[in-house]
């Protein structure tokens, strides 16, 4: 039950996180005009990964896309790449985790397979979250550098240099959305990895080997099997981790890497 809850919660947290990463990537407010200690302007500038916008006091907002690839700073391209990789990995992770959910039955999928998929999706969520956090942090670092390096009458924009009165930029809402979303995706991924441990067989499941003693038959088995006597009707060896739902004759189990997580 706890495993199902952990897995389900991990999935939901990751889902929210990835939605947040997508939202942050699409948002225009990655950097916003710094209003502190600046002359009061009747225009408010803000920039995203894909376009820059200007909101006027009139109520009119004008946004212009960055229609060049080569003219954009390498750092901006790197941030874009990190965010897109994060989204793609997160999306694949979500897809995998849906099939890995313990509460969803797909044919005769084994728990070990579900455990495998849960771990895979967990790792994907962790990497996705790290990509988002890294992307947002790189952009934030770029902003801080530009903020302090800016001179009195020159502004180095996303696409070049313009001789004008200094417009300084500070952290926009998208950065905070990105950090939180990346963190949530990371937490969700960790939860999925924890859930994977509970889903996996607890011990190594080798085929039982019986040794017959002179008095009565006792089956000595490694790890995951109870030693059962030869008396009575229960002559089958049953696994203890699933309450004896299936016998070793019904399903053949092999050692899995998840047993050692």
């Amino acid at each position: 039950m706890a495993v199902t809850a952990c897995q389900g919660l991990g999935f939901v947290v990751s889902l929210i996180g990835i939605a947040g990463i997508i939202a942050a990537t699409c948002m225009d407010q990655w950097s916003t005009q710094d209003l502190y200690n600046n002359p009061v302007t009747a225009v408010f500038n803000y920039q995203g990964l894909w376009r820059s916008c200007v909101r006027e006091s009139s109520g009119f907002t004008e946004c212009r896309g960055y229609f060049t690839l080569l003219g954009l700073p390498a750092m901006l391209q790197a941030v874009r790449a990190l965010m897109i990789v994060g989204i793609v990995l997160g999306a694949i992770g979500l897809l995998v985790s849906i099939f890995a959910l313990k509460c969803i039955r797909i044919g005769s999928m084994e728990d070990s397979a579900k455990a495998n998929m849960t771990l895979t999706s967990g790792i994907m969520f962790i990497v996705s979250g790290l990509c988002a956090i890294a992307g947002v942090s790189v952009f934030a670092n770029m902003l801080v550098t530009n903020f302090w390096m800016s001179t009195a009458n020159m502004y180095t924009g996303m696409g070049g240099m313009v001789q004008t009165v200094q417009t300084r930029y500070t952290f926009g809402a998208a950065l905070f959305v990105g950090w939180v979303a990346g963190g949530l995706t990371l937490i969700g991924g960790v939860m999925m990895c924890i859930a994977c441990r509970g889903l996996a067989p607890e011990e190594t499941n080798y085929k039982a080997v019986s040794y017959h003693a002179s008095g009565h038959s006792v089956a000595y088995k490694p790890g995951g099997f109870k030693a059962s006597t030869g008396f009575g009707s229960n002559t089958k060896n049953k696994k203890i981790y699933d309450g004896g739902a299936r016998t070793e004759d019904e399903v053949q189990s092999y050692p899995s890497k998840h047993d050692y997580v």
């Epitope: 002359p39 225009v43 500038n45 803000y46 924009g157 009165v165 417009t167």
Partner: antibody
Framework: EVQLVESGGGLVQPGGSLRLSCAAS????????MSWVRQAPGKGLEWVAT????????YYPDSVKGRFTISRDNAKNTLYLQMNSLRAEDTAVYYC???????????WGQGTTVTVSS | DIVITQSPSSLSVTLGERATLSCRSS????????????LTWYQQKPGQAPRLLMY???TRESGVPDRFSGSGSGTDFTLTISSLQPEDFATYYC?????????FGGGTKLEIK
């Protein structure tokens, strides 16, 4: 057609108060910033106040700050200018204007005259 | 505050001639975010409300004849009327619409020579 009609002007004594109104029609009032501009007799134009579309931000020049208050009622499509502690130098024709691209004053009312005199 | 200086204060031009009105700002009115200059030109005739001619320094307002053109960037701007018509004789104001307080120039009165 965009129409702006000012009212509320008149003769007032120094130190007195007056409230100007500007009734707007022909456009979505709640989507535009609005301003008041005045022109003293035989003088140039002077910006008096600006309010953004939702009324959340207001701006004034030092000459009227603390004495004049711009406000709007988007439900009534009306812009207001509350003028307190009036001085002789506030005598002018007051125009209300709709802001447009580039924060330009695209549409103007016909003006209302305010005379501050004892 | 931004100081807007218009020159000349009055200008006498013959009908059909070109008129060039100048406007200078004490600070750059160029916004780096959209590379637009926040300078506006108005025309005002006696007893009438001002009329918008140009915004963003060089964009003509709809309905304004194409004989009116605006140019300049940063701090120096020009309004040019290529061939003066009788209805063009009026007072012209330029305005800073970038910084608060929005400031108007003193105006240029265009008269028939």
């Amino acid at each position: 057609e965009v129409q702006l009609v000012e009212s509320g002007g008149g003769l007032v004594q120094p130190g007195g108060s007056l409230r100007l109104s500007c009734a707007a029609s022909g456009f979505t009032f709640s989507s535009y910033g609005m301003s008041w501009v005045r022109q003293a007799p035989g003088k140039g134009l002077e910006w008096v106040a600006t309010i953004n579309s939702n009324g959340g931000s207001t701006y004034y020049p030092d000459s009227v700050k603390g004495r004049f208050t711009i406000s709007r009622d988007n439900a009534k499509n009306t812009l207001y200018l509350q003028m307190n502690s009036l001085r002789a130098e506030d005598t002018a024709v007051y125009y209300c204007a709709r802001l447009s691209y580039g924060n330009s004053f695209a549409n103007w009312g016909q003006g209302t005259t305010v005379t501050v005199s004892s | 505050d931004i100081v807007i200086t218009q020159s000349p204060s009055s200008l006498s031009v013959t009908l059909g001639e070109r008129a060039t009105l100048s406007c200078r700002s004490s600070q750059s009115l160029l916004n780096s975010g959209n590379h637009r200059n926040y300078l506006t030109w108005y025309q005002q005739k006696p007893g009438q409300a001002p009329r918008l001619l140009m915004y963003w320094a060089s964009t003509r307002e709809s309905g304004v004849p194409d004989r009116f053109s605006g140019s300049g960037s940063g701090t120096d701007f020009t309004l040019t009327i290529s061939s003066l018509q009788p209805e063009d004789f009026a007072t012209y104001y330029c305005q800073n619409t970038y910084y608060y307080p929005f400031t108007f120039g003193g105006g240029t009165k265009l008269e028939i020579k």
